[in-house]
């Protein structure tokens, strides 16, 4: 889904009833610690020397919904995610580095503590480099491990 074309229909009130108390996780992992803004996430990443994982998604996108479920239910991904600064966004930031090849959802971009966007860590789709589908959990897990191997930091 390309959010530059259409940002999704209004959320149906019937679909909006929270099953659990609403948290910053938005269903991507209620046991994980999520940051609220990109600025906060960058600060936390830099000061804690942990990579940042940014998930762009939309409530009204079937593929965002589907990826969210497998992400939240994947025990290994959830465990590995504890080593990241985490941010999920339902809106686009002004930082164009977070959309190297377009503003589609869902997409997952990693940022190094040196505040370098890891454009080299991509999914399997050549037309949407940072897209992942439910069948791509093994690749996403591998990419998370890649992101944990930090770029050389300045002394």
């Amino acid at each position: 889904k390309d959010t530059t074309v259409k940002s999704g229909a209004k959320k149906d009130p019937k679909d909006s009833r929270p099953k659990l108390p609403q948290t910053l996780s938005r269903g991507w992992g209620d046991q994980l610690i999520w940051t609220q803004t990109y600025e906060e996430a960058l600060y936390r990443s830099k000061t804690s020397n942990r990579p940042l994982m940014v998930i762009h998604h939309l409530d009204e996108c079937p593929h965002s919904q589907a990826l969210k479920k497998v992400f939240a239910e994947h025990k290994e991904i959830q465990k590995l995610a504890e080593q990241f600064v985490l941010l999920n966004l339902v809106y686009e930031t002004t930082d164009k580095h977070l959309s190297p090849d377009g503003q589609y959802v869902p997409r997952i971009v990693f940022v190094d503590p040196s505040l370098t966007v890891r454009a080299d860590i991509t999914g399997r789709y050549s037309n949407r480099l940072y897209a992942y589908e439910p069948s791509d959990t093994a690749l996403l897990y591998d990419n998370m491990k890649k992101a944990l191997k930090l770029l050389k930091t300045e002394l």
């Epitope: 889904k1 390309d2 074309v5 259409k6 999704g8 229909a9 019937k14 679909d15 099953k19 269903g27 009204e60 996108c61 079937p62 593929h63 919904q65 589907a66 479920k69 497998v70 239910e73 037309n127 949407r128 589908e133 439910p134 069948s135």
Partner: antibody, heavy 120, light 107 residues
Framework: QVQLLESGGGLVKPGGSLRLSCATS????????MNWIRQAPGQGLEWIGW????????NYNGKVKDRFTLSADKAKNSVYLQMNSLRAEDTAVYFC?????????????WGQGTLVTVSS | EIVLTQSPDFQSVTPKEKVTITCKAS??????LSWFQQKPDQSPKTLIY???RLVDGVPSRFSGSGSGQDFTLTINSLEAEDAATYYC?????????FGGGTKVEIK
């Protein structure tokens, strides 16, 4: 193997209600999206909505969202379509169809359908 | 909502002939398109998903192609058992929508 079995169809008067069931077996029920689709006599297919049985998340076609409600019972491996304020134009065969085995949105497997007739 | 336009509506084909059915979306749907086969008084059967991926157990004479707005279902060397109505479905965006169907008849 995967099995989906719809039931609960029948004749109902305009304004009436009906609850359809889709009993499933042969796969991990809670981890695949379940869709409902209908087909009016001699017509094409229309998507009604989907539910994720793991947590009950739903999304509906705007044409029916005020009258139709999806639910799931993990203990019974079944999903339900509650239809209220039925109209003649709701007359159709109603199918449940499972999403991809890996949690993907594509429709992988269909039940045989149950006929709902709305008539006075 | 996204509109899918299928063509032709009807096709009469001799066995072993090649059949091509097209599905055009009213907007870009990436590769999120499926094809279904429905025989009279039966439920639909999924043939293809993600535009070109063949479902397990579906004969290799069926294939799908396309991305963006234009998609094609091809049946190479049609067999008598392939007489059916074929539907496309987009699952890129809610509500999911189907094409109007293409009825394939054996001459």
């Amino acid at each position: 193997q995967v099995q989906l079995l719809e039931s609960g169809g029948g004749l109902v008067k305009p304004g009436g209600s009906l609850r359809l069931s889709c009993a499933t077996s042969g796969y991990v029920f809670s981890r695949s999206w379940m869709n409902w689709i209908r087909q009016a006599p001699g017509q094409g297919l229309e998507w009604i909505g989907w539910i994720y049985p793991g947590d009950g998340d739903t999304n509906y076609n705007g044409k029916v969202k005020d009258r139709f409600t999806l639910s799931a019972d993990k203990a019974k491996n079944s999903v339900y379509l509650q239809m209220n304020s039925l109209r003649a134009e709701d007359t159709a065969v109603y199918f449940c169809a499972r999403g991809g085995y890996d949690g993907s949105p594509w429709l992988s497997y269909w039940g045989q359908g149950t006929l709902v007739t709305v008539s006075s | 909502e996204i509109v899918l336009t299928q063509s032709p509506d009807f096709q009469s084909v001799t066995p072993k002939e090649k059949v091509t059915i097209t599905c055009k979306a009213s907007q870009d749907i990436n590769s999120y398109l499926s094809w279904f086969q429905q025989k009279p008084d039966q439920s639909p059967k999924t043939l293809i998903y993600r535009a070109n991926r063949l479902v397990d157990g579906v004969p290799s004479r069926f294939s799908g192609s396309g991305s963006g707005q234009d998609f094609t279902l091809t049946i190479n060397s049609l067999e008598a058992e392939d007489a059916a109505t074929y539907y496309c479905l987009q699952y890129d965006e809610f509500p999911f929508t189907f094409g109007g169907g293409t009825k394939v008849e054996i001459k």
